[in-house]
């Protein structure tokens, strides 16, 4: 039994929030300030993520878990764990390397992020434009011209919504 214990890694007893200190006979030492270990048996603690500048702190670092960041207002998160912050634009704009630029005629963006997308081409579905598009809003397709002949009902179900990012072919 003694032989088995001596072969066992003494560091495996060190819980999260500590590290196995080789300089102190493999004693479990608490993680120093601004560092953490999220699992047991660690030989070092990891440096806490710093949320500064474009990032702000969503969750403080603790001895057992890293800090979590989000973006300062005016920017939004990109990537896993908010690894980047990207500038917001106004509706009717898209972000380019030159900053926020208005959508070109015939395109729209109804969000603060993403790209300007082409207006729906109502005629592809055999429909007519009921409400014109703007930089901020897609066109609204109405009934086809044939549906507007006398005696025909002027109420038709709306055209199916396109998936974001898919422009009409």
């Amino acid at each position: 039994f003694e032989r088995t214990r001596s072969l066992q890694d003494p560091c495996s007893n060190c819980p999260a929030g500590t590290f196995c200190d080789n300089n102190r006979n493999q004693i479990c030492s608490p993680c120093p300030p601004n560092s953490f270990s999220s699992a047991g048996g660690q030989r070092t603690c990891d440096i806490c993520r710093q949320c500064k500048g474009v990032f702000r702190t969503r969750k403080e670092c603790s001895s057992t878990s890293n800090a979590e960041c989000d973006c300062t207002p005016g920017f939004h998160c990109l990537g896993a764990g908010c690894s980047m912050c990207e500038q917001d634009c106004k509706q009717g704009q898209e972000l380019t390397k030159k900053g926020c630029k208005d959508c070109c005629f015939g395109t729209f963006n109804d969000q603060k992020r993403g790209i300007c997308r082409p207006w729906t081409n109502c005629s592809l579905d055999g429909k007519s434009v009921l409400v014109n598009g703007t930089k901020e809003r897609d066109v609204v397709c109405g009934p086809s011209p044939a549906d507007l002949s006398p005696g025909a009902s002027s109420v038709t179900p709306p055209a199916p919504a396109r998936e974001p990012g898919h422009s009409p072919q």
Epitope: G53, V54, F75, L78, G79, S83, M84, C85, E86, Q87, L95, T96, K97
Partner: nanobody, 123 residues
Framework: EVQLVESGGGLVQPGGSLRLSCAAT?????NYWMNWVRQAPGKGLEW???????????YYVDSVKGRFTISRDNAKNSLYLQMSSLRAEDTAVYYC????????????????SGQGTTVTVSS
Amino acid sequence: EVQLVESGGGLVQPGGSLRLSCAATGFTLSNYWMNWVRQAPGKGLEWVANINQDGSERYYVDSVKGRFTISRDNAKNSLYLQMSSLRAEDTAVYYCARGGEGYGVDHYGLDVSGQGTTVTVSS
């Protein structure tokens, strides 16, 4: 450790000039687009300017065009913002920020920024 440290802020009178510097450590500056962003008191963060890897492309928010100049010295791993004809509305904390991998292609995300330097324009 990847780090950006801004300096050069201060109190300046309207119409005056300042030059902000940003020292990069822990990475090679010449591989990245770099940006300046700012946050005025009580306002959201605003993008100010960016510059591509070799300095051949530079872009500015409309409100600073003709007054601010972004530049870089890759040999010194440093980024600069020359500010002239300063106005009260330029009062803000200015941050240097690195464009993340794929900046300008897939996204315009910033992945590293400094603690900021404060610019106050007042008489």
